[in-house]
């Protein structure tokens, strides 16, 4: 996590706080959102379990053109210790359905809230 | 309105268990975002937090007395209980519940404040 | 655990005066940083969250500011009803700690 330091300030940022800095921008897009997020695009849904941060990338980095999510994607890929490109879905072990961005924003923001409450950092 | 109301034994002998109450008015423990902490505040002295519990049953603790300290929720009688065990004169305080809301940022400001019980701990 | 250092402890000021009361952090918490006034005999009430967001029913003249490790609050006027001990609190992440309270007095 030590390189989450870039976006945000300078040095190595604390686990709680880089989760603390993606709970806020997804709290932000949710908030902000005026017309359907990213023209209402579809991503493949994921299991918030383990290797969550890595299948949430490979399911968003396929939405292009956004830049909505952008900041969303370049944290994510702070959280997640291997390189992820667009058409990548090693960490996606289900991929039977399609949610709208917004829904899957909202869902994750959801599972992140509660690690936070839990202190589940890493 | 929302309130908050502590009741407590007042007095509790050294290395006997502490069982605090907290009940609570106005809104529900059931409700998504809410929380409940503990804080106490020794006579003359600062604030000190103890712990919380969310209305999904996730709870956080001091580590400083975590190995003493048991937060849990009645969510029929809307209460919430603090158990510490193995008391001593320097855990005499006064003990406030409080709320707290985790909707949007999770701010961790305790918004309402119960008027607290004073704990003494003596043989 | 962030540790929060409170200043002035104690200060005396006459009706009308600025005050201002500053808080420190041991690390960056981000704007999580909350106020709390204390009257004597009585539970503590939250005046500010996230560094600036004044409660609801809190009067205009407390406002909050900082950012990083530095925090203060200020009375624009101060009022004999503001005799109390004030608290910050960080709200980053627990253990929730707080400074060590600063005792606003009337001259």
């Known amino acids: 996590l030590t390189c989450l330091g870039g976006f945000a300030s300078p040095g190595p940022v604390p686990p709680s706080t880089a989760l603390r800095e993606l709970i806020e921008e997804l709290v932000n897009i949710t908030q902000n959102q005026k017309a359907p997020l990213c023209n209402g695009s579809m991503v493949w849904s994921i299991n918030l379990t383990a290797g969550m941060y890595c299948a949430a990338l490979e399911s968003l980095i396929n939405v292009s053109g956004c830049s909505a999510i952008e900041k969303t994607q370049r944290m994510l890929s702070g959280f997640c210790p291997h390189k992820v490109s667009a058409g990548q879905f090693s960490s996606l072990h289900v991929r039977d359905t399609k949610i709208e961005v917004a829904q899957f924003v909202k869902d994750l923001l959801l599972h992140l809230k509660k690690l936070f409450r839990e202190g589940q950092f890493n | 309105e929302v309130t908050l109301r502590e009741s407590g034994p007042g007095l509790v002998k050294p290395t006997q268990t502490l069982t605090l109450t907290c009940t609570l008015y106005g809104f529900s423990l059931s409700t998504s975002d809410m929380g409940v902490d503990w804080i106490r505040q020794p006579p003359g002295k600062g604030l000190e937090w103890l712990a919380h519990?969310?209305?999904?049953?996730?709870?956080r603790y001091n580590p400083a007395l975590k190995s003493r300290l048991t937060i849990s929720k009645d969510t029929s009688k809307n209460q919430v209980v603090l158990k510490l065990t193995s008391v001593d004169p320097v855990d005499t305080a006064t003990y406030y519940c409080?709320?707290?809301?985790?909707?949007?940022?999770?701010?961790?400001?305790?918004?309402?404040w119960g008027q607290g019980t004073l704990v003494t701990v003596s043989s | 655990d962030i540790q929060m250092t409170q200043s002035p402890s104690s200060l005396s000021a006459s009706v009308g005066d600025r005050v201002t009361i500053s808080c420190r952090a041991s690390q960056d918490i981000r704007n999580y940083l909350n106020w709390y006034q204390q009257k004597p005999g009585k539970a503590p009430k939250l005046l500010i969250f996230y560094t600036s967001k004044l409660h609801s029913g809190v009067p205009s003249r407390f406002s909050g500011s900082g950012s990083g490790t530095d925090y203060t609050l200020t009375i624009s006027s101060l009022q004999p009803e503001d005799i109390a001990t004030y608290y910050c609190q960080q709200g980053l992440t627990p253990p929730l700690t707080f400074g060590g309270g600063t005792k606003v007095e009337i001259k």
């Open positions: 409080a709320r707290t809301v985790s909707s949007g940022y999770i701010y961790y400001a305790m918004d309402y």
């Open positions: 519990i969310w209305w999904d049953d996730v709870k």
